[in-house]
Interface confidence: medium
């Protein structure tokens, strides 16, 4: 006769491991008992369980409640056992020793491999600001056994670097994604993808990029010079900029206080019916936590009675 087993049995942490051991004997042969032991190199054999044809299943105190026979129907020549709720410490070599009559004893070894699926974590890097050089956007760490694979899925252009740390029964892999921040990256997803044989599908963690910036400021409203004349109603100046975080706007007049009746509504400066006292230099001040910008315009309110053309100067400063 001969023993049938597997070279390697692979289970995921927490699953039940079936340790196979089947005696394929000749007619009339009987199995008296099957002894299972843990036989890691450098350590003595530690009994796991013993299946006896007459006395039944005996379980070592160290494995109490964790070793069972497979559910019926059972073949008397089958010495397989179930190791419940496999843990990392169960990984190693096991020996099945079968005592048969009249053929004698047979033994076989198998290796139990316990896969420990990773629980990945993603950590954003420091705040991203336009104008920085190559900067850490995020790092992703996953620990498992065997070592997981950590990659990145994104439309954003960048570079990756990985490092791994081996522990006694697992390995931790950390991958970093570096980029040169630009405003076009705002709102773009950066996804860490972790692959592992213990996972049914890849695990994905997505981080949305936020890049701080502030665009140059400009003022609209003075495009048609002929509209800025005494008596005109609904005249307004609008300050244009964009940024992350969204900027706040402030209006001032360079050559004095804002005239009475002029309304400030965020990025918009609204005028009452125009008079010559509305002429002057107006400054739009745009700021966020990242930066600040200024844009100034000269308003010259014309008297329609006069024939001279309106002069408008636009000056932008930052």
């Amino acid at each position: 006769g001969e023993l049938e087993t597997s070279d390697v049995v692979t289970v995921v942490l927490g699953q039940d491991a079936k340790l196979p051991c089947f005696y394929r004997g000749d007619s009339g042969e009987q199995v008296g008992q099957v002894a299972w032991a843990r036989v890691d190199a450098g350590e003595g054999a530690q009994e796991l369980a013993l299946l006896h044809s007459k006395y039944g299943l005996h379980v070592s105190p160290a494995y109490e409640g964790r070793v069972e026979q497979p559910p019926p129907p059972r073949n008397p020549l089958d010495g397989s056992v179930l190791l419940r709720n496999a843990v990392q410490a169960d990984e190693g070599e096991y020996e099945c020793r079968v005592s048969t009559f009249p053929a004698g004893s047979f033994q076989a070894r198998l290796r139990l491999r316990v896969l420990v699926p990773p629980l990945p974590s993603l950590n954003p890097g420091p705040a991203l600001e336009e104008g920085q050089g190559l900067t850490l956007a995020a790092s992703c760490t996953a620990e498992g056994s065997p070592a997981p694979s950590v990659t990145w899925d994104t439309e954003v252009k960048g570079t990756t670097s990985s490092r791994s740390f081996k522990h006694s029964r697992s390995a931790a892999v950390t991958s970093e994604f570096h980029l040169v921040p630009s405003r076009s990256m705002n709102g773009q997803p950066l996804t860490c993808v972790v692959s592992h044989p213990g996972l049914l599908q890849d695990q994905r963690i997505t981080h949305i990029l936020h890049v701080s910036f502030l665009a140059e400021a400009s003022v609209r409203g003075l495009e048609d010079q002929n509209l800025w004349h005494i008596g005109r109603e609904g005249a307004m100046l609008k300050c244009l900029s964009e940024g992350q975080p969204p900027p706040s706007y402030n209006w001032t007049r360079l050559d004095g206080p804002l005239p009475s009746g002029v309304r400030v509504d965020g990025d918009t400066l609204g005028f009452p019916p125009l008079t010559t006292e509305h002429s002057g230099i107006y400054v739009c001040h745009v700021s966020n936590e990242f930066s600040s910008r200024d844009s100034q315009v000269t308003v010259d309110v014309l008297d329609p009675q006069e024939d001279s053309g309106k002069q408008v100067d636009l000056v932008s400063a930052s």
Epitope: G32, Q33, A37, L50, Y55, V59, S60, P61, F101, P102
Partner: nanobody, 118 residues
Framework: EVQLVESGGGLVQPGGSLRLSCAAS????????MGWYRQAPGKQREYVAT???????NYADSVRGRFTISRDNSENTVYLQMDSLRAEDTAVYYC????????????WGRGTQVTVSS
């Protein structure tokens, strides 16, 4: 040939405890399985518990959680700690040992009486 000698039996009240011992005349390392059976008056011999040379154990459902089998290979002795005894545990308790060679050889002791009564 292996001689098995039991001791520790006696009279005990319900809920009480007893500890049976069984000494073997040869090293228990070579004795593959040792254990206990019992026989009540007018009944068949009934399995109680067994222990392997490596310390793995098995129990009859009727005693699981109340009885504990242990083994001291250096003293060539097997023990049966019996707690929460009941009247139905009254029986002659026999030590058994099995030697595995080309076929299983089973040895028996003469037995020790356990009586549970108030």
């Amino acid at each position: 040939e292996v001689q098995l000698v039991e001791s520790g039996g006696g009279l005990v009240q319900p809920g009480g405890s007893l500890r049976l011992s069984c000494a073997a005349s040869r090293s228990t390392f070579s004795l593959n399985i040792m254990g206990w059976y019992r026989q009540a008056p007018g009944k068949q011999r009934e399995y109680v518990a067994t222990i392997t040379s490596g310390g793995s154990t098995n129990y009859a459902d009727s005693v699981r959680g109340r009885f504990t089998i242990s083994r001291d290979n250096s003293e060539n002795t097997v023990y049966l700690q019996m707690d929460s005894l009941r009247a139905e545990d009254t029986a002659v308790y026999y030590c058994t040992a099995e030697l595995v060679r080309r076929g299983p050889t089973t040895y028996w002791g003469r037995g020790t009486q356990v009586t549970v009564s108030s």
